[in-house]
């Protein structure tokens, strides 16, 4: 084969957002017949030669960035995309509200606001069923997530988290769920 071996995939099951003391499994998946897998925790000098890492109880020290590669013969693959493993429940939950309210007409606008008593500068908003968050690039304590021209696809259950940019993998507990209802569709 010419060029480097293709990169494997790295995933966290059931999720990369892991409440403290709950289990999670990191799984590196390459092609069949791999000689050796290497799973690394970045910025810690740690590695292990296994495709699967089972964490029976999530700890603060295990939060961070992970990456994996594999070796066939003397050749190493390209590294996987980095996986960000986040410990949640490290801090008290923020509150999530909708302005002007949780019921909004199709085509209207709504702003979801995540509020915390602590001096966190980062917020993440998740919609149930979506793997990726709506991340807020702004840094303020009263985090606003405007949703312009609402459609039926925006209806659902939302939760937000707060955290500090100094410790980006240690998050609060999730807010209580907020049900966004889109009417007139």
């Amino acid at each position: 084969q010419s060029g480097p071996l293709p990169k494997p995939s790295l995933q966290a099951l059931p999720s990369s957002l892991v409440p403290l003391e709950k289990p999670v499994t990191l799984r590196c998946q390459g092609p069949p017949g791999v000689d050796l897998y290497r799973l690394e925790k970045l910025s810690s000098s740690r590695y292990q030669d296994q495709a699967v890492l089972f964490i029976p109880a999530m700890k603060r020290s295990l939060a961070g960035r992970y990456r994996c590669s594999y070796q066939n013969g003397s050749l190493w693959s390209l590294p996987s995309d980095q996986l960000e493993l986040v410990a949640t429940g490290v801090f008290a939950k923020p509150s999530l509200s909708a302005q002007p309210g949780p019921a909004v007409s199709s085509g209207g606008d709504v702003t979801l606001q995540c509020q915390t008593r602590y001096g966190f500068d980062q917020f993440a908003l998740y919609k149930e069923g979506d793997p990726a968050p709506y991340k807020n690039p702004e840094r303020w304590y009263r985090a606003s997530f405007p949703i312009i021209t609402v459609t039926a696809a925006h209806s659902g259950t939302y939760r937000c988290y707060s955290f500090s940019s100094r410790d980006p993998y240690l998050w609060s507990a999730p807010s209580d769920p907020l049900e966004l209802v889109v009417t007139g569709t």
Epitope: L36, Q48, D49
Partner: antibody, heavy 123, light 112 residues
Framework: QVQLVESGGGLVKPGGSLRLSCAAS????????VSWIRQAPGKGLEWVSA????????QYAESVKGRFTISRDNAKNSLYLQMNSLRAEDTAVYYC????????????????WGQGTLVTVSS | QSVLTQPPSVSGAPGQRVTISCTGS?????????VHWYQQLPGTAPKLLIY???NRPSGVPDRFSGSKSGTSASLAITGLQAEDEADYYC???????????FGGGTKLTVLG
């Protein structure tokens, strides 16, 4: 306490072979990655080869690939380096070094080193 | 030619502070790998001095400290003493072929 003692160095002609040994004591040898690291006279450190605890995971520096073979015998707490097709530029003190380990994790640094054994390749 | 770049030599008077730099690239230090430092006294084997960028093994005086930023790292020695005269090596890991890499070494001379 942890001890690593290298042996087997000596004078060898270019193209010749030599087998280095490293006797380990004071720790559970089979749980640890170990490496060979060399230092040419008056020069810096160069990593040569590493081997995982079970012996199945091995890695080599490009400069020795195909000529050197690392192996271990966990029953004898010993690490080996078989060096073939030796060249003048392989002349160096060869150290064996243990990689730090904690729980199930290995680490990318060396916490204990042997005193080294000198290999001289010259006609 | 070493993968990590260090100055060949540094010097300082007793009691002074000196720093030794270690510059890598996006495939080693910049790829999320830590930097570790070793001290090699004349005629002896290297000894681990700093691990994980800034951590000291037990027995290493707090006059020695390390830091990392981006693709480079540095070792600082304060209150320089005659017994600090040695060669210092930085070490990291390289993502390309998963090999361990060293700097070329820096000879520290304590003046006077």
């Amino acid at each position: 306490q942890v001890q690593l003692v290298e042996s087997g160095g000596g004078l060898v002609k270019p193209g010749g072979s030599l087998r280095l040994s490293c006797a380990a004591s004071g720790f559970s040898f089979g749980d640890y990655y170990v490496s060979w690291i060399r230092q040419a006279p008056g020069k810096g450190l160069e990593w040569v080869s590493a081997i995982g605890g079970s012996g199945s995971a091995v890695q080599y520096a490009e400069s020795v690939k195909g000529r050197f073979t690392i192996s271990r015998d966990n029953a004898k707490n010993s690490l080996y380096l078989q060096m073939n097709s030796l060249r003048a530029e392989d002349t160096a003190v060869y150290y064996c070094a243990r990689h730090y380990r904690e729980f199930r994790w290995h680490y990318y640094y060396f916490d204990y080193w042997g005193q080294g054994t000198l290999v001289t390749v010259s006609s | 030619q070493s993968v990590l770049t260090q100055p060949p030599s540094v010097s300082g008077a007793p009691g002074q502070r000196v720093t030794i730099s270690c510059t890598g690239s996006s495939s080693n230090i910049g790829a999320g790998y830590d930097v570790h430092w070793y001290q090699q006294l004349p005629g002896t084997a290297p000894k681990l001095l700093i691990y994980g960028n800034s951590n000291r093994p037990s027995g290493v005086p707090d006059r020695f400290s390390g830091s990392k930023s981006g693709t480079s790292a540095s070792l600082a020695i304060t209150g320089l003493q005659a017994e600090d005269e040695a060669d210092y090596y930085c070490q990291s890991h390289d993502l390309g072929a998963h090999v361990w890499v060293f700097g070329g070494g820096t000879k520290l001379t304590v003046l006077g």
